[in-house]
Structure formats: structure tokens, C-alpha cells
């Protein structure tokens, strides 16, 4: 029983991660699998035989870099449920050819500790005791959304806002991993997927400022409030 090298990968909720795996010399099926709690088996997530596990469809890609002796698996639109133990491997039997263990932890951005981070000071001459004489502030209920482009700044009429009830579809976030130079990657995501995603994005583009605000609000909340545990308040 050989001990596998282990790597830990941190991912941000809604973001993406790239898992780096060793690539064997011989031309053989390679894969990323996920260890199933309880059963001890490792279920294929993605492999070079064009298999993609259902819950990862449209958000996982596998690219090989033979000259670098590695392959990369990118997972986008991360959710809490993606946290877990994965393994890279090679060979026809997913359970047998593991080369590296990968622990993925998906979380909201880490909130700096209260004690550790010095609080930035406001200008010394802006005296806070003066600030303290304030009555309760009542805000206006009227708000306006504006889309600003380099060419123009157009105003739209005020929109009535209520809590978001729209079904949200996230656009896949661009990967932060830098690509590996020197190789043209071989991608094993079915070729139609990219065009389908782009067509879908066209269809799903928010039609109104209100929808746009709520769609984005949902995503921001997922980033900031989505997977906090204990005291890791994100924001």
C-alpha cells in the first residue's frame, strides 16, 4: 500500500480552482475522481474518455501538458458541496491508478481577525465625539440603477425593488490559474459546450435593471454569506 502525495487546494465560493496533477509517461486514460464518504471508492469526476460526472457538467475541464508532465483540472462555479477529497490518477481502473490525493476546501473569502488587523484611522481632525450627537437616520426608499459604460452613462427610471425571487444562473468565473506555457492544451470538454455556454449567457442576460441587481446580489451574497462556519464572517 503506497502512500499518495497529498495537496490541499482552497477555493472561493462561486469562483474556480485549478488542480495540478502528474501526467504519466505512457499514453493512458487520466482522470480526477472524488472519494465517496463511507464506501471508500473513488468516483470519476472527469476523464480523458470524455466522461464528466453529472454535477460537474459545464464547469470542469481537463487539459494535458505532456511537456510539463502534468495535467490540469479546472473546476468553476464552486459550491460548498464541492468540498471534499479528490484524487488524480491514470489507468482504466479509477480506484487503482491514483497518483495524488487532493483535498478541496471551498469557502467564502477569509475574514481577517479583529485582533490581528489594525483598524484604519479616520483623519485626526474629524472628531468622533461630534459624530456621536446623531439622531436615528431614516433613509429614502427610492433607488435608481445605472449601467455605466465607457461610452455613455445612461440613467434609467427608478425601479421598485423587492427581495430576489428569480432563479439565478451564474456565469462561469474566469479561472485565476495562470496557464502553463509551451504547450497547446488538449481539452476534453465536449467541443459544443463552450458555444452552448456562450449562447446560454446571451439568453440569460438580465433584461431589466431590477433583475440585473437581484441576480448579481444573489451571487454576491453567495460569496459573502454562503459557507461561513463559526466566526468566519465573510464580506
Amino acid at each position: 500500500l503506497r502512500i499518495l502525495p497529498e495537496v490541499k487546494v482552497e477555493g472561493e465560493l462561486g469562483g474556480s480552482v485549478t488542480i495540478k496533477c502528474p501526467l504519466p509517461e505512457m499514453h493512458v486514460r487520466i482522470y480526477l475522481c472524488r472519494e465517496m464518504a463511507g464506501s471508500g471508492t473513488c468516483g470519476t469526476v472527469v476523464s480523458t474518455t470524455n466522461f464528466i460526472k453529472a454535477e460537474y457538467k459545464g464547469r470542469v475541464t481537463l487539459k494535458q501538458y505532456p511537456r510539463k508532465n502534468l495535467f490540469l483540472v479546472e473546476v468553476t462555479q464552486l459550491t460548498e458541496s464541492d468540498s471534499g477529497v479528490y484524487a488524480c490518477g491514470a489507468g482504466m481502473n479509477t480506484d487503482r491508478g491514483k497518483t495524488q490525493k487532493v483535498t478541496l476546501n471551498v469557502h467564502s473569502e477569509y475574514e481577517p481577525s479583529w485582533e490581528e488587523q489594525p483598524m484604519p484611522e479616520t483623519p485626526k481632525w474629524f472628531h468622533l465625539p461630534y459624530l456621536f450627537q446623531m439622531p436615528a437616520y431614516a433613509s429614502s426608499s427610492k433607488f435608481v440603477t445605472r449601467v455605466t459604460t465607457p461610452a455613455q452613462r445612461g440613467k434609467v427610471p427608478p425601479v421598485h425593488h423587492s427581495s430576489p425571487t428569480t432563479q439565478i444562473t451564474h456565469r462561469p468565473r474566469v479561472s485565476r490559474a495562470s496557464s502553463v506555457a509551451g504547450d497547446k492544451p488538449r481539452t476534453f470538454l465536449p467541443s459544443t459546450t463552450a458555444s452552448k455556454i456562450s449562447a446560454l449567457e446571451g439568453l440569460l442576460k438580465p433584461q431589466t435593471p431590477s433583475y440585473n441587481h437581484h441576480t448579481r446580489l444573489h451571487r454576491q451574497r453567495a460569496l459573502d454569506y454562503g459557507s461561513q462556519s463559526g466566526r468566519e464572517g465573510q464580506g
Epitope: 472561493e12 473569502e109 449601467v147 427581495s163 425571487t165 460569496l223 459573502d224 461561513q228
Partner: antibody
Framework: QVQLQQPGAELVRPGSSVKLSCKAS????????LHWVKQRPIQGLEWIGY????????HYNQNFKDKATLTVDKSSSTAYMQLSSLTSEDSAVYYC???????WGQGTLVTVSA | DVVMTQTPLTLSVTIGQPASISCKSS???????????LNWLLQRPGQSPKRLIY???KLDSGVPDRFTGSGSGTDFTLKISRVEAEDLGVYYC????????FGGGTKLEIK
């Protein structure tokens, strides 16, 4: 760590405009909305609006729609707020803060005075 | 209008004693996603505000457990079990369910 850097103070003339900056670091700038908040003596904290740095979509409190203009420069990870037609009522500390107000800049004191 | 009303305006407390601040909203802050976006900030003298509590009762990293947040719907409370000198400043509640609104602030001063 996440930081939002703002200049300490701006002294401006009535009727003019001022552009305040907020330089973000320690996180992916385009992933998180940035809010702007006004703090005046007596009035407390007042939400001005937010900008989504990924594509500059903005959302304003109606009270500030003709006063404030929010923009970003992605290349320098900096957000800006321009305040126009300044009066003494605009004298305040202006903060930028990230989406759920867990991270704040140190604030810029704007003083409107002849 | 979502108006956030905080009471009292000023709170004078002896070190080691408990303190309680109330925050009432003019409409329910329970969102359609099942979460209540009611949060608390502390602005210490000469500093920027700092978030203490989010989603009614969750403490931010590093916030001492003498702070507790509670409430639902429209009525919320921030409690400090034993006030310490570093707790002085102005406490604000704010809501993020219906855009963003801040309460008027409660100044905590040490007797």
C-alpha cells in the same frame, strides 16, 4: 490581507467637484461590489451606492443619483466616486467598503469651504 | 421605506456590567432566500466602522464571545455580557435585505 486605501482629506471649493479614490488589494477586485458610504456629524452613516467592478454596473441611493458618480479602473484595482456641485452639505467623511461591509477604507474627509 | 431605529441613543455602562442595544426595522428583514440580513458594526473613536455580527447572530472572526446578536423579523438586539474598555464607540445596526440602510447609532460610553 484585504485592504481598501483612501486618501486622508480633500479641501474643495463650493460649486466644484471632487473625485475620491479607493484602491483595493488583497483580493480579486472584480469579484466583489464596492459600496460608498457618507458619514456626517449628526446624520450617521448613509449609503450612497455600489459599483460592480466586473462591468461597472452601478446602483444608487436616489438621494445621491445627481450628486455621485461611481466608476472603476480595473487595471489599477481602484474605485472612484466623483461628487459634483459641492456645497457645505457635502462636507463629510466618505468611506468605500466591500460588499457586506466587512472591509472598510479609512475614509476621506471632504471639506467644502470657500 | 426600510427605517432602522436604534435605542438608546447613548448607553453609559460600568466596566464588567452587561449592555443591550435594540434595533427595530420598519419592515421584516427576512429575505425570500430564508436569511435575515441584519448586521452590527462598531465604530471606535477615530476609526473606520468594523463589522461585528452578520446574519443576526454570527460573530465575525476575532470578535469576543461576550458579544451576542439575536432577534428576527423586525426586532433585533445586540448584547454585551461584560463590557470592557475596548468596547466603547458607536454601534450601528444595518440591514442588507432591502438594499442597505443603517440605524442611527448608539454611543456606548464607559461610566
Amino acid at each position: 490581507q484585504v485592504q481598501l486605501q483612501q486618501p486622508g482629506a480633500e479641501l474643495v471649493r463650493p460649486g466644484s467637484s471632487v473625485k475620491l479614490s479607493c484602491k483595493a488589494s488583497g483580493y480579486t477586485f472584480t469579484n466583489h461590489w464596492l459600496h460608498w458610504v457618507k458619514q456626517r456629524p449628526i446624520q450617521g452613516l448613509e449609503w450612497i451606492g455600489y459599483i460592480d467592478p466586473s462591468d461597472s454596473l452601478t446602483h444608487y441611493n436616489q438621494n445621491f443619483k445627481d450628486k455621485a458618480t461611481l466608476t472603476v479602473d480595473k487595471s489599477s484595482s481602484t474605485a472612484y466616486m466623483q461628487l459634483s456641485s459641492l456645497t457645505s452639505e457635502d462636507s463629510a467623511v466618505y468611506y468605500c467598503a466591500r460588499f457586506s461591509f466587512a472591509y472598510w477604507g479609512q475614509g476621506t474627509l471632504v471639506t467644502v469651504s470657500a | 421605506d426600510v427605517v432602522m431605529t436604534q435605542t438608546p441613543l447613548t448607553l453609559s455602562v460600568t466596566i464588567g456590567q452587561p449592555a443591550s442595544i435594540s434595533c427595530k426595522s420598519s419592515q421584516s428583514l427576512l429575505d425570500s432566500d430564508g436569511k435575515t440580513y441584519l448586521n452590527w458594526l462598531l465604530q471606535r473613536p477615530g476609526q473606520s466602522p468594523k463589522r461585528l455580527i452578520y446574519l443576526v447572530s454570527k460573530l465575525d472572526s476575532g470578535v469576543p464571545d461576550r458579544f451576542t446578536g439575536s432577534g428576527s423579523g423586525t426586532d433585533f438586539t445586540l448584547k454585551i455580557s461584560r463590557v470592557e474598555a475596548e468596547d466603547l464607540g458607536v454601534y450601528y445596526c444595518w440591514q442588507g435585505t432591502h438594499l442597505w440602510t443603517f440605524g442611527g447609532g448608539t454611543k456606548l460610553e464607559i461610566k
